[in-house]
């Protein structure tokens, strides 16, 4: 009956931690005799390529300083402890403990047995390193350039992770990588660039960073800031101001980042009316007459500029009572 | 403590057998197989085969397969072997030898001098 | 069947040399060799298995090498007890096979 090494074919483990490469002689056959087992690396230099041995009287044997006996352990063989004990040996099961990049690579697990031979099975080790990761947004403003307006950054990841973003902005992405702090590891930044505009002001943006460590993509919302001037309308004309009308008012409705820091209230015509008193965003007008017969200019300031909006205004002799139009903009 | 203890020289003419013997001790005899070696001086080291008393299976090497027959009896730990149609060719120190890790323990050898 | 050639029949060294036994297989046999001292009148007692692991209560002076098909037994600082026979064996395949020896003198 063959017998047959049972290996898997790559086995991945976190970098610092522990891993196990699962190594087992199937079936059992009665008389087959497994004299030693041996595990090594067959692509490392030649004075490092044995890894470990185990011989059922001495036990296990770790000659080589990488990764070395501190690191190194069979899981479940066992030697001959007396003349009443066999060594069990079909578990070949190799532990690697304190993960190094150095590790990574194809280990061979054989087993000697009489009177079948040799047969070996190899693993891939790969290790792995698990990102953390972080996006924040970037305090911009305003202009007619790409600027960076979030980060997102993958730190110390192996293999370096992928990182994308969702968003309906129109937006380009540039990644730079950089070795990380630990050996063999990545860092990867992704900055969301974008002319910033207050259209960006406070839209959130998701980055999505993928790595084979982890069960499903992090989804890490960000939140744009964008400095912005000010973005006005005016707001409350309903093109039925009439001669001593006096439920009117006009607002002035503001998107800004950061918050106004003034409004100020003016006719193109140069000629305010007295009837019409400024109350910050507000312009509440007392009675209307035919000095409304103007175009209102609100004009609003912020630490990053100013903003304005005009709205053209008709005085009727009488109210319309067809029924209220549309409200001006 | 594992011991190997073997039978002594033998002296015999040509064509005629021989049977040796090979009495093992301070290990569970049935889970190892036991090994026979020859040595002619000047000639290195030949494995002949091995015999495994846990269920008397043996298997040999093919160039001493119509020389030697291996045999064991769990009974009292010992394992046989015989050498047939003996001829000067035979003339050798024969070991048994437990197979361990390597062959780990070793008789002290059995001398076959096979002359007219 | 696989050949081990030990092409050195006899070797000379003087106490406190270094010497090397060498062992050719005919084919590729990993790392599956080992390697037996022999001193006259005894039974062969293992040195080094797996190429390159020493056997327990073996002097460090005793170190094997190699893989594939060239393997090799060095003795650092030989001393008189080394004055000995040595050889090389595979266990890679059914038939076992051992080299034909190399007998280390001392001068």
């Known amino acids: 009956q063959d017998v047959r090494v049972q290996v898997l074919p790559e086995v991945r483990g976190q970098l610092g931690g522990t891993v196990e490469l699962p190594c087992h002689l199937l079936p059992p056959v009665p008389g087959l005799y497994i004299s030693l087992v041996t595990w090594q690396r067959p692509d490392a230099p030649a004075n490092h390529q044995n890894v470990a041995a185990f011989h059922p009287k001495m036990g296990p044997s770790f000659p080589s300083p990488k990764p070395g006996s501190e690191r190194l352990s069979f899981v479940s063989a066992k030697q001959s402890t007396g003349q009443d004990t066999e060594a069990e040996l079909q578990d070949a099961t190799l532990a690697l403990h304190g993960l190094t990049v150095e590790d990574e690579g194809n280990y061979t697990c054989e087993f000697a047995t009489f009177p079948k031979g040799s047969v070996r099975g190899m693993t891939w080790l790969r290790v792995i390193a698990k990102p953390k990761n972080q996006a924040e947004a970037q305090k911009v403003t305003f202009s007619q350039d790409p600027t960076t307006v979030a980060l997102c950054i993958s730190k110390e990841g192996r293999p370096p992770a992928r990182i994308s973003w969702l968003s309906s902005l129109d937006w380009e992405a540039k990644e730079t990588q950089v070795s990380g702090t630990l050996a063999g590891t990545v860092t990867v930044t992704s900055r969301f660039t974008l002319v910033p505009s207050g259209r960006a002001d406070g839209v959130t943006v998701t980055c999505k960073v993928e790595h084979e460590s982890f069960e499903e993509p992090a989804l890490i919302p960000v939140t744009l800031s964008v400095r912005y001037p000010p973005e006005v309308s005016i707001s409350g004309y309903d093109d039925n101001w009439y001669l001593g009308r006096t439920d009117a008012t006009l607002s002035c409705d503001v998107r800004s980042n950061p918050e106004p820091t003034g409004y100020d209230w003016s006719t193109t015509s140069g000629t305010f009316p007295t009837s019409a008193v400024a109350q910050g965003s507000q312009l509440v007008i007392h009675a209307v007459d035919s000095l409304f017969n103007t175009t209102f200019v609100c004009t609003v300031t912020n630490a990053v500029g100013m903003g304005r909006a005009e709205q053209v205004i008709f005085v009727r002799e009488t109210p319309n009572t067809a029924g209220a139009g549309a409200t001006g903009g | 403590e594992v011991q190997l203890q073997q039978s002594g020289t033998v002296l015999t003419r040509p064509g005629a057998s021989v049977k040796m013997s090979c009495k093992a001790s301070?290990?569970?005899?049935?889970?190892?197989?036991i090994h026979w070696v020859k040595q002619r001086p000047g000639q290195g080291l030949e494995w002949i085969g091995a015999?495994?008393?846990?269920?008397?299976?043996?298997n040999y090497n093919q160039k001493f397969k119509a020389k030697a027959k291996l045999t064991a009896v769990t009974s009292t730990s010992t394992a046989y072997m015989e050498l047939s149609s003996l001829t000067s060719e035979d003339s050798a120190v024969y070991y048994c030898?437990?197979?361990?890790?390597?062959?780990?323990?070793w008789g002290q050898g059995t001398t076959l001098t096979v002359s007219s | 069947d696989i050949v081990m050639t030990q092409s050195q029949k006899f070797m000379s060294s003087s106490i406190g040399d270094r010497v090397s036994v060498t062992c050719k297989a005919s084919?590729?046999?990993?790392?599956?060799v080992v390697w037996y001292q022999q001193r006259a009148g005894q039974s062969p007692k293992t040195l080094i298995y797996?190429?390159?692991y020493r056997y327990s209560g073996v002097p460090d002076r005793f170190t094997g090498s190699g893989s594939g098909t060239d393997f090799t037994l060095t003795i650092s600082n030989v001393q008189s007890e080394d004055l000995a026979e040595y050889f090389c064996?595979?266990?890679?395949?059914?038939?076992?096979?051992f080299g034909s020896g190399t007998k280390l003198e001392i001068k």
């Open positions: 030898t437990k197979l361990v890790g390597t062959f780990d323990y």
């Open positions: 301070g290990y569970i005899f049935t889970s190892y197989w």
């Open positions: 015999v495994y008393p846990g269920n008397s299976d043996s």
């Open positions: 084919q590729n046999v990993g790392i599956n």
């Open positions: 797996s190429a390159s």
């Open positions: 064996q595979q266990y890679n395949t059914n038939p076992f096979t």
